[in-house]
Interface confidence: low
């Protein structure tokens, strides 16, 4: 595996993306771990939801979040309020049983943020606060994500919404058909359950989908 470098600015958020083959890693949970030394173990930082179908839900461990677009095949890790000690070698992993496949090796580098102390949080160059009144600054790092903030919904969420919409249409059609034929609608078959209460419930009955 080649190592991909992601650079972030101290005090801001860094988003790390790990693309993978969504078919090959179908049904597998993912994890983000920190490499301890060149030959040391990879220490788990955060992993996706225990229910694979809920992998799109962002999970936090301290200032690190993970979310998985299982259909699009992109694992996204957010390191919020990046600190100098966050720099180092990490791995995106795909879990199966007690084994883990490396999806991507990531080197996180933390660049100094010599901007205004009041806004920047952890500044690695405290002498810089007065020096940047007139300096030209190019910001290539996106703004920090708030903890409750949800980015653009991944493919899996869109699919679930489509599922809900489709099931409701089917249920309405069945009710309409029953009414048209003058029959009393009986108990709903499983296919008509409203998956809005548990977005993963309906899809969990599909073959091959299980939490590993």
């Amino acid at each position: 595996h080649n190592t991909t470098v992601f650079q972030g600015v101290a005090g801001q958020s860094l988003q790390v993306s790990c693309p993978y083959d969504s078919m090959k890693h179908w049904g597998r949970r993912k994890a983000w771990c920190r490499q301890l030394g060149e030959k040391g173990p990879c220490q788990r930082v955060v992993s996706t939801h225990n229910l694979w179908l809920l992998s799109f839900l962002r999970r936090w461990n301290g200032s690190t979040a993970i979310t998985d677009d299982t259909l699009g095949g992109t694992l996204t890790i957010t390191l919020r309020n990046l600190q100098p000690h966050d720099a180092g070698l990490y791995q995106c992993q795909s879990l199966h049983g007690s084994e883990a496949d490396t999806l991507r090796k990531v080197l996180v580098e933390v660049l100094a943020d010599p901007l205004d102390h009041r806004d920047a949080g952890d500044l690695w160059f405290p002498g810089e606060s007065e020096s940047f009144e007139d300096a030209h600054v190019e910001h290539s790092i996106s703004r920090s994500l708030l903890e409750g903030e949800i980015p653009f919904p991944p493919t899996s969420i869109l699919l679930l919404l489509a599922c809900i919409f489709l099931i409701k249409i089917l249920a309405a059609s069945a009710l309409w058909a029953a009414a048209w034929h003058g029959q009393k609608p009986g108990t709903h078959p499983p296919s008509e359950l409203d998956c809005g209460h548990d977005p993963g419930y309906q899809l969990q009955t599909l073959p091959g989908l299980r939490d590993t």
Epitope: P84, E109, P126, G127, H136, V137
Partner: antibody, heavy 122, light 113 residues
Framework: EVKLLESGGGLVQPGGSMRLSCAAS????????MNWIRQPAGKAPEWLGL??????????EYNPSVKGRFTISRDNTQDMLYLQMNTLRAEDTATYYC?????????????WGQGVMVTVSS | DILINQSPASLTVSAGEKVTVSCKSS????????????LAWYQQKPGQFPKLLIY???YRHTGVPDRFTGSGSGTDFTLTISSVQAEDLAHYYC?????????FGAGTKLELK
């Protein structure tokens, strides 16, 4: 491997000018703050100034002791750092080093060049 | 400018001895927002350029032997060599990077008996 190599030193008369160069290799030059430091024989180093990285517009910071006489610049296409020294005085005689501020290093200088000797004398 | 008072100016020790070098700054080098102290230690062997030993007051630079330890916070800092080796013969300098201009201590010359 990170390497910094200074050149351009030598003997210059008081009141004269000199330009020092520092060739950088082994790292992404535009990502780093670059510094000049000098050290008179038998004395402690003296920080002269720095030039910031691409993200911060390659702006400069100087020690008041040399501000107005010394100018730091960089050529990012050639991975070169420069120190232009004007109106040189005898007290500017020293070994001059270029050095890099490391990422995550709190402003400290993680790599230095071998240094180049500048002698200001008539 | 922040003034750095480094002591002692010189030390003569035997191999295996423990050595401590002190640096005191004229103002605190602890930046509360990052909870970091902005002090570095350098080693300069005769005829060579300075090499970074310790940054952020206590973080050992890559490849630096663990007999070198940096400690302290605020205005008082210490470099400790737990068991001096022959190759440690050098000048040692501390440097503050809390505010411009960055300033160095006058240095400590470590000699072996």
């Amino acid at each position: 491997e990170v390497k910094l190599l200074e050149s351009g030193g030598g003997l210059v008369q008081p009141g004269g000018s000199m330009r020092l160069s520092c060739a950088a290799s082994g790292f992404t030059f535009t990502d780093f703050y670059m510094n000049w430091i000098r050290q008179p024989a038998g004395k402690a180093p003296e920080w002269l100034g720095l030039i910031r990285n691409k993200a911060y517009g390659y702006t400069t910071e100087y020690n008041p002791s040399v501000k107005g006489r010394f100018t730091i610049s960089r050529d990012n296409t050639q991975d070169m750092l420069y120190l232009q020294m004007n109106t040189l005085r005898a007290e500017d005689t020293a070994t001059y080093y270029c050095a890099r501020i490391g990422i995550n290093y709190g402003g400290s200088l993680d790599y230095w060049g071998q240094g180049v000797m500048v002698t200001v004398s008539s | 400018d922040i003034l750095i008072n480094q002591s002692p100016a010189s030390l003569t020790v035997s191999a295996g001895e423990k050595v401590t070098v002190s640096c005191k700054s004229s103002q605190s080098l602890l930046y509360s927002e990052s909870n970091q102290d902005y002090l570095a230690w350098y080693q300069q062997k005769p005829g060579q350029f300075p090499k970074l030993l310790i940054y952020g007051a206590s973080y050992r630079h890559t490849g630096v032997p663990d007999r070198f330890t940096g400690s302290g916070s605020g205005t008082d800092f210490t470099l400790t060599i737990s068991s001096v080796q022959a190759e440690d013969l050098a000048h040692y300098y501390c440097e503050q990077t809390y505010s411009y201009p960055y300033t160095f201590g006058a240095g400590t010359k470590l000699e072996l008996k």
